[in-house]
């Protein structure tokens, strides 16, 4: 995984760190999975499981891998070219307006409403008024009459942090 190369032509403080694989930048940029050295002469590989870069870049630091929070499951691990993919656990979801935490899905709809959408990792159950068919949004008052729902299947990531 590592390639030791000598760089006698470089200023002494810019020589290669032996534990990291290096290549040369192309037009001042380094490929995904790398960052640029501070003298601009080398592309240094990110550390698997610790940091990453997704695009051609001139980053001085690779980006830190996201750690999934409790209440989240890791769909795919962090690689040198892709951040960790985290998803809310079954029965919970993450809203766009509160992306920092997974919230519990409602167990059913209020009286006079019917469920038309299941709980998914990225959305709560969806309720509509029986007659009008208009969606219900916002906090639910005390549920008097509920229609039970099974948690949605975690099919795809609800957030790609990073």
């Amino acid at each position: 995984e590592s390639a030791l190369i000598t760089q006698q032509d470089l200023a002494p403080q810019q020589r290669a760190a032996p534990q990291q694989k290096r290549s040369s930048p192309s037009e001042g940029l380094c490929p995904p999975g790398h960052h640029i050295s501070e003298d601009g002469r080398d592309c240094i590989s990110c550390k698997y499981g610790q940091d990453y870069s997704t695009h051609w870049n001139d980053l001085l630091f690779c980006l830190r891998c996201t750690r999934c929070d409790s209440g989240e499951v890791e769909l795919s691990p962090c690689t040198t070219t892709r951040n960790t993919v985290c998803q809310c656990e079954e029965g919970t979801f993450r809203e766009e307006d509160s992306p920092e935490m997974c919230r519990k899905c409602r167990t059913g709809c209020p009286r006079g409403m019917v469920k038309v959408g299941d709980c998914t990792p990225w959305s709560d159950i969806e309720c509509v008024h029986k007659e009008s068919g208009t969606k219900h949004s916002g906090e639910v008052p005390a549920v008097e009459e509920t229609v039970t729902s099974s948690p949605g299947t975690p099919a795809s990531p609800c957030s790609l942090s990073g």
Partner: antibody, heavy 117, light 108 residues
Framework: EVQLLESGGGLVQPGGSLRLSCAAS????????MSWVRQAPGKGLEWVSA????????YYADSVKGRFTISRDNSKNTLYLQMNSLRAEDTAVYYC??????????WGQGTLVTVSS | EIVLTQSPGTLSLSPGERATLSCRAS???????LAWYQQKPGQAPRLLIY???SRATGIPDRFSGSGSGTDFTLTISRLEPEDFAVYYC?????????FGQGTKVEIK
Amino acid sequence: EVQLLESGGGLVQPGGSLRLSCAASGFTFSSYAMSWVRQAPGKGLEWVSAISGSGGSTYYADSVKGRFTISRDNSKNTLYLQMNSLRAEDTAVYYCAKGVRVSFDYWGQGTLVTVSS
Amino acid sequence: EIVLTQSPGTLSLSPGERATLSCRASQSVSSSYLAWYQQKPGQAPRLLIYGASSRATGIPDRFSGSGSGTDFTLTISRLEPEDFAVYYCQQGTTHPITFGQGTKVEIK
């Protein structure tokens, strides 16, 4: 011989702005990442900001994020630090330094920024 | 962020004596990104050691650096009058870059 020469420091009121410059010579400026490091009177060194050789990537200490902007003009071999919304705690000698992560191998003589009413 | 703690805060020694300065990191840092600087009053810092143990250009061999992981040491084998100054360690492993608070080496 590598030389870094800062300018632009001075006395400014809280909330005011100042732009520091660092003229570089003696090395291929556009290839190297550059930094600003500051030192409050009688205190230790604090890294402030860094920029990649092309200027495409910039980094800031939390204490200055959103208020300071680092930039460079490679055609003029000059590094800049635009400082806005200045506070009393920003009072320090500001050094321009060559390098970022491995080391700061060359430093300017520093320019004093005093934030006071 | 990685916090670097230097000890002792002040070291009182006589010329000719050996000085041992410590720099401890709050989490592991790469040796490739650990440097030491010397600063005298009214002057800019000067790079002494980079990569934990490599001497910068023009630095006398009485200065040496060692260590890995979280514990690093700067040793001045035999203090010269011009070595009395403040010494800082610095890490560049993770953003933000951080310095230790400094160790002052003063004449006893």
